[in-house]
Every structure is written in C-alpha cells, then in structure tokens.
Interface confidence: low
C-alpha cells in the first residue's frame, strides 16, 4: 500500500512543482521524493524498507499518475542509498537518495529544487507546502493526481511536550501542525518546501494522522548538507 | 439514516451548569471518519461551533468557551453529552448537535452532514 | 466578529439568479461548506468542498471558492428558497467557523 498521503490539501496546480518525484514501486506509487539535482531524486530511507526484490523507479514531470503528459517520465535507479545511520525502529537519519539510471531531461515541468544548506531553524509560524499523491478518503480511494496543503512549522520546544513528540524531535528534524491537515505515512519522502526552497524531507515513521497533538515529522535537509555534498560527488 | 436528538432542560439558572445530551441512532458514535459536534445560535444570530469529540474520543473545544466546556460520552448509550458551566444570559441560544464528517482522518473537520432539530436553551433566574 | 463575513440579507425575484457571498482571509486554504436554514429548522447541507452537493439537493444550487471569497449560487431562486443561509470554513486555528449568515428574500 502507498505509504502515505496528503490530508486535507487540495489538488495542486498541475506541474508547479518540477521538483516533485513519484518513487515507485513494481509501477505503484510507494512515496514522494524531490529531485536535487539532474540524476538525483532525495526521498525516505523507511520507504524502501519493504522494498526487497521489487522493481524501483522515479517517475518525473507527473501531475496524473496514469494519464498521458508529454513531461512525464519513467526513470530506473541505478544506485539507492540510505543514509548511513537510518534505523528501521527510529525516524533519526531518515533520507534517501536515488540516482537515476540517466540525468533527467529538465524543462518546465522537471527541475530540481533547490535545498537549504543554511542549517537554521525555519521560524515557527512560516507557511509551507507539502504535496504527495495517495489515500484520500477513508474508502482508500487514492488520488490520480498531485495533492498538496499548506502548513505551519511548529516550534520544537512545542513538538516535543510530553503531550506530543515527547522529546523525540532532535536538531536534525523539524515540526509542522497537523491540526486535521497534515502528512501521512505514505507522503514520506516528499518535500517540505518554505519560501521555495526545500527544508525538509517527509519523515516515513507510523504516526497518527491529522491530530494536532501529533505533528508532522520532518528531517532537515540542511542538517545533512555534508552527506548529501558527499553522495552527489 | 443517521439521527440524532438533542435533550435536557431548556431553562437553566445564571451561574449554574448547563447540560445537554445528543442521543445518536442509526450509526455508532465510535465509527472511524466522523466526529461529533455542538453549535449554538443565539436568537437572532449566526451560529457558533462549540466544540467537537472524535471517535477516539478526544476533544476540541472553541477556544472563547474552552475554560467553561466540556464534551464527554457514553459509548455504550451511543451518547454524547455537553457541559457548559458559569452561564449568563448571553449563553441563551437553541443548541444542535451534529455530526462533523471527515474525509481524510478520524478528525479532520470538514462539515456537518447531520444536525439534530436543536433544543432552545434559556438562562434567567 | 466572525473570521468569515456575509452579506446580512439579500432579495432576490422569483426565478433569478441568486449570489450569496462569504469572504474570509483563509479560504484559500480551506474548503468552503454551506448550510440552508428555513425558520424553526435545523440547518441543512446543501453544497460542500466548495462546489459538490449532496444528493437530494436540486441543481440550481453550485458553489465556488476563489481568491478569498465563497460563492453560493442560486439559479432561478424558488419561493422555497427563502431562509438563511450560512457558509461554515476554518480558522486560522483550523477550528470550525460559521458567517454571520444571509437572509435570503424571494420576491
């Protein structure tokens, strides 16, 4: 099953954001992912974890997941590489990045997008967007095209009240509200983008959806500016 | 058909508690994707959200009553009651109970598909 | 004061068309839902998620949301058309939020 969604969002304004990548699974979309460079796509390390011997691409310039678009393109992964200290039992570490099997051919539906590597706290109160394709209604009916929803970062002190996170939101991960609009699951991997530039990535750990005492989870790309520099060498 | 059915007394001395019940039939007021709610109109007035209880119970509450508010329930009268305490004349008001659906989450407000017929209630001494 | 804002009252001849408005700083966010309420009634759904209706509720009534301001349509208005009608969002808390709702006049 998809591994994740956009709750209370709408559908997106088709093929705004260039960045956004269907990592998919055997043809099924499995999570988000954003692309950060030509042949570069930066996802959810969880996302694979069920993965095994199954067939993973990158589909780019989508907005319909099954209808024809000239910008849509399927993209086989050459290489998959979890962050190193990505554990299956924690949301710590949790990034992933896909290189494609050739540089994408960019254009106005595919750009990558480029990512914080300032390593500051976005201030709390500021707008930003999530999208994801996935599950929509509790019928399970999933949406052919892209979602997205606008939601505030939610300071960490906050976050991390017993009530909430309980201490879990490290430096390296930031919150968003999820006061009945949030992400889900099966959006891991896709992209928190404030100010048009990306913050953060779609945490994929089992968390309740839509409550406002369980924000939105994500990790900080810029406190992983050094592996990302690293692996895209 | 879901329905519901608001009951309690309809005149209630200032400063006391004013308490209602929502007595649901034809659905559970456990079932996943809907949350129960309370709307007052005062007369004369537009009508003003209360508060809400998911169906795992949690509540949410109007931020201008959450210090006089609360929202409980009998799941196994498949009921939901409210309790609003401290009343002056300005909580006279018929008062609805509904049924809040969601669409994405357990709670994730959207609208109200179900309303009951709403109970006038009157503060005065 | 209401987070969303509608005209007090509105009249409207027998079988024109019929535009109630609801303007709120956040609905560009948040779906916009409307409510039919006949004196002495309940309120009634008649169009949610902007622009969808229910079943049961006749096709002169459509709804749209754009640029910050909701709009209920009522094509060629009935006599039984006539009540008040409140357009429900959130706000800025995501909480629910009603207008002050709109007396509808068929005359």
């Known amino acids: 099953p998809p591994r994740g969604r956009i709750l209370g969002g709408r559908e997106a304004e088709a093929h705004a954001r260039p960045y956004m990548a269907s990592v998919q699974l055997n043809g099924a979309h499995l999570c988000g992912g954003v692309l950060v460079a030509e042949q570069w796509v930066l996802s959810a390390a969880h996302c694979l974890e069920d993965a095994a011997d199954g067939k993973v691409q990158v589909l780019l310039g989508a907005h319909s997941l099954s209808q024809p678009e000239p910008s849509k393109r399927l993209y086989d992964v050459l290489r998959a590489v979890p962050h190193p200290d990505s554990q299956p039992d924690t949301i710590d570490h949790d990034l992933l990045l896909l290189q494609l099997s050739e540089k994408a051919t960019l254009g106005p539906a595919v750009r990558p997008l480029p990512w914080q590597r300032v390593d500051r706290d976005v201030a709390p109160g500021t707008l930003c967007d999530v999208a994801g394709w996935g599950i929509v209604n509790h019928a399970g009916r999933r949406p052919d095209s892209l979602q997205h929803v606008l939601l505030p970062v939610l300071d960490r002190a906050t976050c991390n009240r017993r009530t909430h996170h309980d201490g879990a939101i490290t430096e390296r991960l930031m919150c968003a509200e999820s006061n009945r609009r949030d992400s889900c699951k099966g959006d891991s991997g896709g992209p928190l983008v404030c100010g048009g530039v990306l913050e953060g990535v779609v945490t994929s750990g089992s968390r309740v959806c839509g409550n406002r005492k369980k924000p939105g989870i994500y990790t900080r790309v810029a406190s992983y500016a050094a592996w990302i520099d690293s692996v895209l060498a | 058909q879901v329905q519901v059915q608001e009951s309690g007394p309809g005149l209630v001395k200032p400063s006391q508690t004013l308490s209602l019940t929502c007595t649901v039939s034809?659905?559970?007021?456990?079932?996943?994707?809907?949350?129960w709610s309370w709307i007052r109109q005062p007369p004369g007035k537009g009508l003003e959200w209360m508060g809400d209880i998911a169906n795992d119970g949690s509540t949410y509450y109007s931020p201008s009553l959450e210090s006089r508010v609360t929202i409980s329930r009998d799941t196994s009268k498949n009921q939901f009651s409210l309790q609003l305490s401290s009343v002056t004349a300005q909580d006279t008001a018929v008062y609805y109970c509904a049924r809040l659906r969601s669409l994405y989450t357990d709670y994730d407000p959207h609208y109200y598909d179900y309303w009951g017929q709403g109970t006038l209630v009157t503060v005065s001494s | 004061s209401s987070a969303l804002t509608q005209p007090p009252a509105l009249s409207v001849s027998k079988g024109q068309t019929a535009r109630i408005t609801c303007q709120g700083n956040l609905l560009p966010r948040h779906y916009a839902h409307w409510y039919q309420q006949k004196t002495g009634q309940a309120p009634k759904l008649i169009v949610y998620?902007?622009?969808i209706r229910p079943s049961g509720i006749p096709e002169r009534f459509s709804g749209s949301n754009s640029g910050g301001v909701a709009t209920l349509t009522i094509s060629g208005a009935q006599a039984e058309d006539e009540a008040d009608y409140h357009c429900?969002?959130?706000?800025?808390?995501?909480?629910?939020?009603f207008g002050g709702g709109t007396q509808l006049t068929v005359l």
């Open positions: 998620d902007d622009n």
């Open positions: 429900q969002s959130a706000d800025s808390n995501d909480d629910a939020v």
């Open positions: 034809g659905g559970s007021i456990s079932t996943s994707y809907y949350a």
